[in-house]
Structures are given as structure tokens and as C-alpha cells.
């Protein structure tokens, strides 16, 4: 019987692999290399979105396209080969940080070159898997010392993205110390990211189980045929009925004119490491993409002048000398947006249980989406956080962090 | 009722710089995506560009004839949206027109002010 | 940029004929596309938005269909009212863009 691989399918130095087909016969699998997809990987990666990056391993959007941002001493598309290896090596060994949820890596002579070891509860080439255990009363303890040292650096150290070490004292998940604190059912941040109806966990507290008992046959995330129309065309003051779905964003409310605001409590306050005027620029696009992550309506608080609330954020000063302040203006490093959500459309969709009722539940929910490696969001982000309403503060305040 | 009133056009010399106005009345303007379109004379429409609402960041588009050279602002508590427009060329020569965009096309447009550009 | 077509440039119609006037994009703008008529003098006025949907106000007697990269303004009768010049205009990206317009003068 001739291989399904032996016509060679796989395109773009895709490695093929046999595979169950329908009614029992063969099929193939392609994968890809980076940064190519698709079932015979015959597309490219356009976005962050399409591009998988080894797990650890951030992706960046960059002029010539989505890449992966190889830790040091790993290079090519998938950071799988050293500098210098030949072409198909693939030595994704432990720089890459394969392994989640705590679990320690270990390299390994064959391919992949590495092996994982899993912390309690975990299971997978991985550890990406919960393991089926009994409920447990609370969360163990953090299992590394040296985690107590990296909590807090501003970078996500993945051996100590766990409950148990505060995912890495909140490095991994924008700030916000425990997404899920709110949640009673203690699993719930296991179940997250399984792409399976856990009704325990479908609560607005438990983060609605990440939309997981929503979903319902809808699509999760916008077709990437209609999103970068829908970023161009987003609050163009143009209904776009494509556009005006949850998973799009609902047009920046292009077809709401009529319908009366519905604001969420208080504000969402997001860092984003791109300078205001940067920011500014992609505005529509970094609204779009974001109200579609969390399938509500974000626009810009405004000030009492009408101005935008996108303040300079300014990198924090060691130690902090007001004489060095003085000496020399504060380089600014990003941006404190301050956003307004509008829930008219989320509470009037058919499915109208899963809107976020305050700012603080939905900077919980990105801080989520950041801890289990599932936040799809091309802007860098630093922090995130709720604010209660405080009146708007006039236009020439700048924020010194 | 809802209205648009362009204003500060005139004669300006090659190079020169000029300000338009638009005032806007009887709608709440802050919300509104505003455009600039414009018309040589004996021409026909050319769009010249657009401003956001401020809520969505206030960006601006612009057609590649003005890029760079002209620049479209607001200013939510006047109820005004400008068109500053520098290093004039005498094909700027036009009748220039501010519109509102409405997502269910109810368009709203001024009378439009003439800008003449010449030596 | 998408380009706009339009055709013809110029027509001589009497009061009661109809009157087609066609517009071409230069790429796909599905159903974009937006007809103004415009009298001398004055400022534009939107006679169908999305290719196909009359403007409140608008007289029946006007109608549009096409989509992609095909439109067609349609007056059913011309009435004296109608001799002015037309315009389409796209809005699926910018820079949006207009036709060069199509006059109809009265035979």
C-alpha cells in the first residue's frame, strides 16, 4: 500500500506523517515548518495568530511578518536548531522552556532533544495536560526556591508559571497576582485552556471557562479573511455587518448608534510597551483586536478636554534619585491606556451571560489568557488592571511610573 | 437641526499655509467619524480624508496627493474638526467640503469654502 | 489605490427615458460602493449607499445593484429633477475614492 506521504504533500519543507483517515483508511498530517500552516502547509503566516511558536517562545509582528523570538543560542524559524546546524536539525532542547506548568526539563539525546518532567497533576510531552487526579483542597505550595527570587523581574519565568508560585508572582500574567482568585471551584485554572464545556467553571468569576460553554458551534476568534478588514474599518462610522460579531469586535459599535451605552464598572488599565504616539497610530487595530479577545466593545477613555487617556509611560529609575530625574527627562518606554468597556451589544447577543461586569474581570481574564499562553495580542503588554470610575483627569496629567 | 459650516478659505500663495474650519451643531460631534472631500473646479470629487473619534484614538487617514502636507484635527469641546493644510500647491486649488459619516449613511455635508491657490 | 470607472462621462437623456450609468473598481470592493448626485453649485448628495440601499428621501425611481467589482445606477423615468452629474464613490478601503462623474444633460 503506497504511503499517504508518498506524493510528498507537504509543502515548504513540511514534514509529512501518516495518519487515521476516514472510514479506516490512510491520510496524512502535515507539519510545517514556520511559518508556514495550513493542512499541506501551503499558507503563510500573516499574524502572530497563525504562527506557532515553540511553546516559551514569544511571537513579534515585524515589518516582514510575524517571527518567532528566539531565546539566545537557538535560531531559524521554529527556534529548533543551533546557529550553524544544518537545515531540518531539530535541537529544540530546553532553551526553548518546552515544558509547562512547572514541570523541569531535561535534554534528551533523540528528537526532540529534550524531556520533561512534570510537576503534580501534570501530564504530556509537555506537561500541557491536567492529569486525571482527585479535586484537591488548595494549590501546593510553590515547589521551587528559586522561584522566589524571579518573582517579580518583569520577565515570565515558565518553571514558575503555577498557581503554587503566584505564575511567577505575576510576571506571567500581566500583574494580576491570581486570575482566577475569585473562582471557588479550585481546578478551574486547569481547565482553562482545554478547549472543552466545563460548566463549573462557565461562572463570570471562573473567567467563563474561557468562553469554552459559549462557544457553541460559533467561531472563537474572527476569520482571518475578514480581520484585517475589520481593523481598517473599525469605528470608521460604516456599519459592517461582517465586522459586527463578538469575535470581531462588533465593529467599534458602527451598528449601535441607536443602541444606549452599557458600560462595564470602572476602568481597564493596560501598559503597553509602545510610546503613546506609536500606539496612537494603530489605534482602530489595537481596539479591534482587543475587543475581540474579549468579545465586548473597548474604546478609549476620554479626558475632561475630550483627549484620549494614553499616557507616556516612563522606564522605572533605579532606585529612583530625583537628582538623576532631574538631570535627565525620564525615557519613555510605553504607554498607560485607559479604556472604557461597553457591553450594549455583548448583553443584547442571544447568549448574553459572558460580559464582563466590571473592568477588573476583564483585566483578569487577559491576565489568564497571558498565564496559560493562550493571549493572542500582537501590542506588548507589561500589566493590566482595573480601576474603579474616578472622574476624568484633565488632559496635560502624564503618568511617572 | 444638524449641520455642517465650512470656513477660512481664500487666496493663498504657493507654499503658503491655511486653516480650515468646520463647525458642527445640532448632533453630538464627539462621536462621529468626520471627512474632508474636495473639488477642483469644473473637477469632480476627490476624497481628501478622515478623522476618527477621538474614543478610538482620533487617527487620521489621508489620500497620497496631501500626505504629509495637510492635516486633519478636532476639537470635541468647540465642536470644530480642521484641515490645516501647508506647502499649498495650485492643484490645491478646490472647493472644500467637510462631511459626517453615519454607520446607517444618513450623510450630513457643509457648504463647502473655496480655497484658492495661486501666485 | 482602487481606481473608479465610470461610464459614460457624459449623457443626453429626455424626461421620461431611463437612464443606466455604470461604474467599475479596480479590484473587488464587494458591495462598497456608494452613487451621489451632485448639482452645480451645491454640495453632494447621497442617492444609494452599499450598492443597492436608497437613502431616505430618495426618490423610488432610483435603484443600484452590482457588487464586486460591477455597479449600475439605474433612474427608472428621468424627471426634470434628475439632470445633474453623478458620482460613485467606494468606501472598502482607504483612500476612498470617487469616479470622475457622469453628467446627464437634457437632450
Known amino acids: 500500500v503506497l504511503s499517504p506521504c508518498e506524493s510528498q504533500p507537504c509543502q515548504h519543507g513540511g514534514q509529512c506523517r501518516p495518519s487515521p483517515g476516514p472510514g479506516g483508511g490512510l491520510t496524512f498530517t502535515c507539519h510545517c515548518a514556520q511559518p508556514f500552516w495550513g493542512p499541506r502547509c501551503e499558507r503563510v503566516a500573516r499574524s502572530c495568530r497563525e504562527l506557532q511558536c515553540p511553546v516559551g517562545v514569544p511571537c513579534q509582528q515585524t515589518p516582514r511578518g510575524p517571527r518567532c523570538a528566539c531565546p539566545p543560542g537557538l535560531s531559524g524559524p521554529s527556534c529548533r536548531s543551533f546557529p550553524g546546524s544544518p537545515p531540518g536539525a531539530s535541537n529544540a532542547s530546553c532553551a526553548a522552556a518546552p515544558c509547562l506548568h512547572g514541570g523541569s526539563c531535561r535534554p534528551a539525546p533523540l528528537a526532540p532533544f529534550f524531556r520533561c518532567a512534570c510537576a503534580q497533576g501534570w501530564t504530556g510531552p509537555r506537561c500541557e495536560a491536567p492529569a486525571a487526579a482527585p479535586e484537591v483542597s488548595e494549590e501546593p505550595r510553590c515547589p521551587r526556591a528559586a522561584c522566589q527570587a524571579k518573582r517579580g523581574d518583569q520577565r515570565c519565568d515558565r518553571e514558575c508559571n503555577s498557581p503554587g508560585c503566584g505564575w511567577d508572582g505575576g510576571d506571567c500574567s500581566l500583574s494580576v497576582g491570581d486570575p482566577w482568585r475569585q473562582c471557588e471551584a479550585l481546578q478551574c485554572w486547569r481547565l482553562f485552556n482545554n478547549s472543552r464545556c466545563d460548566p463549573a467553571c462557565s461562572s463570570p468569576a471562573c473567567l467563563y471557562d474561557n468562553f469554552d460553554c459559549h462557544a457553541g458551534g460559533r467561531e472563537r476568534t474572527c476569520n482571518p479573511v475578514y480581520e484585517k478588514y475589520c481593523a481598517d474599518h473599525f469605528a470608521d462610522g460604516r456599519c459592517d455587518q461582517g465586522c459586527n460579531t463578538e469575535e470581531c469586535g462588533w465593529d467599534g459599535l458602527d451598528c449601535a448608534s441607536e443602541v444606549p451605552a452599557l458600560l462595564a464598572r470602572g476602568v481597564l488599565v493596560l501598559t503597553v510597551l509602545l510610546p503613546p504616539e506609536e500606539l496612537l497610530r494603530s489605534s482602530a487595530d489595537f481596539l479591534q483586536r482587543l475587543s475581540a479577545i474579549l468579545r465586548t466593545s473597548l474604546r478609549f477613555r476620554l479626558d475632561a478636554h475630550g483627549q484620549a487617556m494614553v499616557f507616556p509611560y516612563h522606564r522605572p529609575s533605579p532606585g529612583s534619585e530625583p537628582r538623576a530625574r532631574r538631570e535627565l527627562a525620564p525615557e519613555v518606554i510605553g504607554s498607560v491606556v485607559m479604556l472604557e468597556i461597553d457591553n450594549r451589544l455583548c448583553l443584547q447577543s442571544p447568549e448574553n451571560d459572558h460580559c464582563f461586569p466590571d473592568a477588573q474581570s476583564a483585566a483578569d481574564y487577559l491576565g489568564a489568557l497571558s498565564a496559560v499562553e493562550r493571549l493572542d495580542f500582537p501590542y506588548p503588554l507589561r500589566d493590566v488592571r482595573g480601576e474603579p470610575l474616578e472622574p476624568p483627569e484633565p488632559s496635560h496629567h502624564h503618568h511617572h511610573h | 437641526q444638524v449641520q455642517l459650516v465650512e470656513s477660512g478659505g481664500g487666496l493663498v500663495k504657493p507654499g503658503g499655509s491655511l486653516r480650515l474650519s468646520c463647525a458642527a451643531s445640532?448632533?453630538?460631534?464627539?462621536?462621529?467619524?468626520m471627512h474632508w472631500v474636495r473639488q477642483a473646479p469644473g473637477k469632480g470629487l476627490e476624497w481628501v480624508g478622515r478623522?476618527?473619534?477621538?474614543?478610538?484614538?482620533?487617527?487620521?487617514d489621508y489620500a497620497a496627493p496631501v500626505k504629509g502636507r495637510f492635516t486633519i484635527s478636532r476639537d470635541d469641546s468647540k465642536n470644530t474638526l480642521y484641515l490645516q493644510m501647508n506647502s499649498l500647491k495650485t492643484e490645491d486649488t478646490a472647493v472644500y467640503y467637510c462631511?459626517?459619516?453615519?454607520?446607517?449613511?444618513?450623510?450630513?455635508w457643509g457648504q463647502g469654502t473655496l480655497v484658492t491657490v495661486s501666485s | 489605490d482602487i481606481q473608479m470607472t465610470q461610464s459614460p462621462s457624459s449623457l443626453s437623456a429626455s424626461v421620461g427615458d431611463r437612464v443606466t450609468i455604470t461604474c467599475r473598481a479596480s479590484q473587488s470592493i464587494s458591495s462598497h460602493l456608494n452613487w451621489y448626485q451632485q448639482k452645480p453649485g451645491k454640495a453632494p448628495k447621497l442617492l444609494i449607499y452599499?450598492?443597492?440601499n436608497l437613502q431616505s428621501g430618495v426618490p423610488s425611481r432610483f435603484s443600484g445593484s452590482g457588487s464586486g467589482t460591477d455597479f449600475t445606477l439605474t433612474i427608472s423615468s428621468l424627471q426634470p429633477e434628475d439632470f445633474a452629474t453623478y458620482y460613485c464613490?467606494?468606501?472598502?478601503?482607504?483612500?476612498?475614492?470617487f469616479g470622475q462623474g457622469t453628467k446627464v444633460e437634457i437632450k
Open positions: 452599499a450598492a443597492s
Open positions: 478623522i476618527r473619534a477621538n474614543a478610538y484614538g482620533g487617527a487620521a
Open positions: 462631511a459626517r459619516a453615519e454607520a446607517r449613511y444618513r450623510d450630513v
Open positions: 445640532g448632533f453630538t460631534f464627539s462621536t462621529y467619524v
Open positions: 464613490q467606494q468606501d472598502y478601503h482607504t483612500p476612498f475614492t
